[in-house]
Interface confidence: low
Amino acid sequence: FNISGCSTKKLLWTYSTRSEEEFVLFCDLPEPQKSHFCHRNRLSPKQVPEHLPFMGSNDLSDVQWYQQPSNGDPLEDIRKSYPHIIQDKCTLHFLTPGVNNSGSYICRPKMIKSPYDVACCVKMILEVKPQTNASCEYSASHKQDLLLGSTGSISCPSLSCQSDAQSPAVTWYKNGKLLSVERSNRIVVDEVYDYHQGTYVCDYTQSDTVSSWTVRAVVQVRTIVGDTKLKPDILDPVEDTLEVELGKPLTISCKARFGFERVFNPVIKWYIKDSDLEWEVSVPEAKSIKSTLKDEIIERNIILEKVTQRDLRRKFVCFVQNSIGNTTQSVQLKEKRG
């Protein structure tokens, strides 16, 4: 299709060589068409003007992305040629940084009525450069933590070397939606809730005598709780004896709850006590069965192919540990009567 009439936007991604940061492009179709396709809709469905060309397509992912090769070859479908670039609805996600992401990206609706095919597309010229000012690397991270229940702020990494006074107007997006009230290089959060977690994008315009372009950075914000002050607790087994049938296979499950720790290094293991001897048992890998902001429940099973008389004399001990301390729960097997 003819891309000469596409609206053009220039973007700059200055990435930190130290982190696996991500980047996004929004399909900024010219108004009013944009409102029909993407979440960042400024019109309610009742306000959609009748002359909108793409009626009947309510699929939010109904845009097509292409890259324009620099050698003049035909446009390439992003989904086929670039595994590190993912399309999610109207957003293009770049999973890895690198200058090889530089280039022209074109988006347009998939369903086009021919009179509008030229006007309804946007060409984004993306320039990707590594961060050269090493001191700026240290100012704001592309992953930021906010502590639930406290105050905090989200800083725009590409502007964190500048003071608030000299900072230009910033446009912020959260999970692809415009945050219209935020205009400074920092979003101040009076009280942090779990809904503050997400992908934030900050844009500002930079100009020289020739042209202007949008400088964009992406921040992954994680809401966290404070490190636990408690050692893990064992939820299962609860009883210290277990009735079993001799000669039958047996699985004993150990489930433990670990509180949040910034550096999370949980230990959950089984060992056997037999008179004065004690040894750790080789058992299947532990698995996380439930994970929340505050804690994680981890399970690890011990499997006996068949219960023997010898097993009745042993104690099976589940041992769990975090950085605060450890907890154990022992189980004695008892032969089922009758």
């Epitope: 240290y138 502590l147 406290s150 404070g226 910034r262 550096v263």
Partner: antibody, heavy 124, light 107 residues
Framework: QVQLQESGPGLVKPSETLSLTCTVS????????WSWIRQPPGKGLEWIGY???????NYNPSLKSRVTISVDTSKNQFSLKLSSVTAADTAVYYC??????????????????WGQGTTVTVSS | AIQLTQSPSSLSASVGDRVTITCRAS??????LAWYQQKPGKAPKFLIY???SLESGVPSRFSGSGSGTDFTLTISSLQPEDFATYYC?????????FGQGTRLEIK
């Protein structure tokens, strides 16, 4: 550019409390963890503990009973108090930013910005 | 606490030499290891994180490798400014611990 500056008395008497402050300039104290590390003369580095901007702390168990780290976000400062000091606490004390570098599914933590260090001598 | 043991404790080398410093952890720490360089009277400077990822601005002659318990820092061709003490540090579990240091001197 974020810079850290330690301040406090260079001489402390045995059994007293060592108090140091680290001032963060060129960036906000918010959203980061901040650590204290010390280095006795001619020896290696020992991590004392960290504080999150919200006040959450984590201390080295070997010093836990004597250490308190606090934060004042309005002044962009965090502080270290070490009680009942002895000659073994003589060291260069550093403050540092303790940052998570983003890997795909986790963070790899490092101390990426350090103060220049302040020497504290414990002597009567 | 996880103990980190560096070897050698000190070594002498010449400009242009290839040098390797090892760091062994008392238990597995995945890739949660960083390397720092410290010059006399100065604060440590962070060089490598995640065992092998080079901090930006650090010359490419520095490289790190390893996972689990055994790690190495290699300087492919020593420069005059590389003579310093090097520390490994683990961030796998608390308390954070450092190796005892390896002092690199001019031969």
């Amino acid at each position: 550019q974020v810079q850290l500056q330690e301040s406090g008395p260079g001489l402390v008497k045995p059994s007293e409390t060592l108090s140091l402050t680290c001032t963060v300039s060129g960036g906000s104290i918010n959203n980061y963890y901040w650590s204290w590390i010390r280095q006795p003369p001619g020896k290696g580095l020992e991590w004392i503990g960290y504080i999150f901007y919200s006040g959450t702390t984590n201390y080295n168990p070997s010093l836990k009973s004597r250490v308190t780290i606090s934060v004042d976000t309005s002044k962009n400062q965090f502080s270290l108090k070490l009680s009942s000091v002895t000659a073994a606490d003589t060291a260069v004390y550093y403050c540092a930013r303790d940052v998570g570098i983003a890997a795909r599914n986790s963070y790899y933590y490092v101390m990426d910005v350090w103060g220049q260090g302040t020497t504290v001598t414990v002597s009567s | 606490a996880i103990q980190l043991t560096q070897s050698p404790s000190s070594l002498s080398a010449s400009v242009g030499d290839r040098v390797t410093i090892t760091c062994r952890a008392s238990q597995g720490i995945s890739s949660a290891l960083a390397w720092y360089q410290q010059k006399p009277g100065k604060a440590p400077k962070f060089l490598i994180y995640e065992a092998s990822s080079l901090e930006s601005g650090v010359p490419s002659r520095f490289s790190g490798s390893g996972s689990g318990t055994d790690f190495t820092l290699t300087i492919s061709s020593l420069q005059p400014e590389d003579f310093a003490t090097y520390y490994c540090q683990q961030f796998n579990s608390y308390p954070i611990t450092f190796g005892q240091g390896t002092r690199l001197e001019i031969k």
